[in-house]
């Protein structure tokens, strides 16, 4: 039995997968910040988690996926306000009783030290210093991401 949040996440991810391939992104769009091979957009307004998920989708992006502790720290370094929380693309899957990224993968328990409960209708937010479990209905800011296309150097055969 999937929760409404899980259904929303799956629907949006599937619709993103169905869309036609777009040319690779070489530079971050205006107002997006580059962090390594990603472009990040930090919202200024607030939304519940599922609206944030939908908003990123309309921007041809996704809620932030964090690969490891190192990426978390670098992302947190871009947060300029101490007390402000941002949704990322991680929520609690009731059916699998585990934290699940919106791309379908499960959280490696070593990656993030989450403060708060792992339970139904819980979604993950980050601040400048911590990672929190919040009710998904809480209205806070959010972070969208777009992947940058790596520029490969052309290799010319010996002349």
């Amino acid at each position: 039995q999937k929760s409404s949040i899980e259904k929303c996440s799956v629907d949006i991810q599937q619709s993103r997968n169905k869309t036609t391939e777009r040319p690779g992104l070489l530079n971050c769009p205006i107002y997006w910040q580059q962090l390594r091979e990603k472009c990040l957009l930090f919202s200024h307004t607030v939304n519940p988690w599922n609206n944030s998920l939908a908003d990123c989708s309309t921007k041809e992006s996704s809620l932030l996926l964090i690969r490891d502790k190192d990426e978390l720290i670098h992302t947190q370094n871009l947060i300029r306000d101490k007390a402000i929380l941002f949704w990322i693309g991680l929520n609690f899957s009731l059916s699998e009783k585990n934290w699940k990224w919106i791309n379908g993968s499960f959280l490696n328990s070593n990656d993030l030290e989450i403060r708060g409960d792992a339970k139904e209708n819980s979604c993950i937010s980050i601040s400048q210093t911590s990672v929190y479990s919040e009710y998904c209905s809480t209205e806070i800011r959010w972070i969208c991401q777009k992947e940058l296309t790596p520029v490969r150097n052309k290799v010319y055969p010996d002349s």
Partner: antibody
Amino acid sequence: QVQLQESGPGLVKPSETLSLTCTVSGGSISSYYWSWIRQPAGKGLEWIGRIYTSGSTNFKPSLKSRVTMSVDTSKNQFSLKLRSMTAADTAVYYCARDPLGSFFDYWGQGTLVTVSS
Amino acid sequence: QSALTQPPSASGSPGQSVTISCTGTSSDVGGYNYVSWYQQHPGKAPKLMIYEVSKRPSGVPDRFSGSKSGNTASLTVSGLQAEDEADYYCSSYADINNLVFGTGTKVTVL
């Protein structure tokens, strides 16, 4: 280059409703916030409210009871309705693009609205 | 939420610098890094000069810079030019339902 153009009546009678439309050209209306701002003659700017292309809205608390906003993505337009107009509502009304919900990077040229019987 | 406080006027000779202050509270300027600045020439729409306290949109000369300390934000125009003569307004996010502007400052190039 994104351009915004306000349209609507220049004269409104007291107690009537002001209806303004902003047409966006040179770019898509989607995935942005769109705001209305007004400026009485010789005075400062006042934010009225914003609408997102999903239709969600936020309004300045003191004006909330009188304001309605709507968006028509198919026409690349968004609209403002301000009820129970009084002389204090006489101002130049601007529409503006609000990319992240806290600042305005493209503005219409403004339309003067006078409230008078 | 009342308007942010700006000095009514500021002036400087060509080539000099002028700094405009914008004072709010911990609920607006002090609470967020979402301060912006606008330039308005008579009879024209405002133009964005600075956003997120200190970021400059493309096309805005680097003579314009923004900063913030506590509840007060500042706009500095260095190397003042005749075309910089205008009204300047600050603005700050206050909450999801409120965005406040400053009272405005008239900058005169002497």
